[in-house]
């Protein structure tokens, strides 16, 4: 699975879109997690609504927001007010019971605001 590299400026928002096969992932919740190490578990940041039919509603954990368009097959994650510490490797996941299928790996690069120089 290829890793997508996305850049965002510190203090601004970064929008991540992960696409998937809507039929294959029908009924499955989605999640966004931080990959702290290759062998370690992916640390859950936020997941979509517990009721799948309400997955289009935005769910928030701190400054991270997730929403799922289950018909279009696109889960959108927004990292608001990007901080230096947000830089790192993440995964979009499709949840099936206790199993998690990786939809996309995302490397987030947080850049310095040139005005802070």
């Amino acid at each position: 699975l290829n890793t997508t590299v996305l850049q965002g400026m510190a203090g601004q928002s970064l929008r991540v879109s992960c696409t998937y096969d809507a039929l294959k992932h029908w009924g499955r919740r989605k999640a966004w997690c931080r990959q702290l190490g290759e062998e370690g578990p992916c640390q859950r940041v936020v997941s979509t609504h517990g009721v799948w039919l309400l997955a289009f509603l935005k769910k928030r954990n701190g400054s991270t927001v997730i929403a799922d368009d289950t018909l279009a097959g696109t889960v959108t994650i927004t990292l608001k007010n990007l901080q230096a510490g947000d830089a790192g490797l993440y995964q979009c996941q499709s949840l099936r019971g206790r199993e998690a299928e990786v939809l996309q790996k995302v490397l987030v690069e947080v850049l310095e605001d040139p005005l802070d120089d």
Epitope: V5, Q7, R34, Q83, A84, G85, E109, E112
Partner: antibody, heavy 115, light 107 residues
Framework: QVQLQESGPGLVKPSETLSLTCTVS????????WSWIRQPAGKGLEWIGL???????IYNPSVKRRVTMSVDTSKNQFSLKLTSVTAADTAVYYC?????????WGQGTLVTVSS | EIVLTQSPATLSLSPGERATLSCRAS??????LAWYQQRPGQAPRLLIS???NRATGIPARFSGSESGTDFTLTISSLEPEDFAVYYC?????????FGQGTKVEIK
Amino acid sequence: QVQLQESGPGLVKPSETLSLTCTVSGGSISSYYWSWIRQPAGKGLEWIGLIYTSGSTIYNPSVKRRVTMSVDTSKNQFSLKLTSVTAADTAVYYCARDLFYFDYWGQGTLVTVSS
Amino acid sequence: EIVLTQSPATLSLSPGERATLSCRASQSVSSYLAWYQQRPGQAPRLLISDASNRATGIPARFSGSESGTDFTLTISSLEPEDFAVYYCQQRSNWPWTFGQGTKVEIK
């Protein structure tokens, strides 16, 4: 298993440029961030800066005007250049993988600044 | 920059004893704090990430906790190989910074 190896001159003259390279083996350099950290003898650790896969960099303000980092994905290497060095730059220099934290380190290379 | 203050500078203990190391941040680091162990002549080794998550392969005797801007590394029962220098490090804000270190020595 990811391994990192620093290489470069162990002795640099004052006012000259310190150049080090870190070679990454056992994994691709492309999906992570990479940092340089130094440690003067008997002292603590100082983060110098990091380079993203894209080549974008973040530097410590303490060395910002003198430092340049670059990455060569084809060789699985990243490098550090520090200009106008003085005796205060004498230290063991480490390269490390920066995946939220420094989870893999090189063994370190001692760079002495002396005429 | 965020200043991390570690205490004590030196901790003299015997094998089997409990070690408690402290790290105080000058401002909030949002749990983005790690602990490293450095043995003489070696590179540092990641022990704890995100204040309390043990890194892969780290023994269960190492644990981390936080209370606001105060962070603690606890070694429940010291083994001979645990006598080393320990550093805390934050990655909440640039520049990443380290504490000055705590040396755990044999009493």
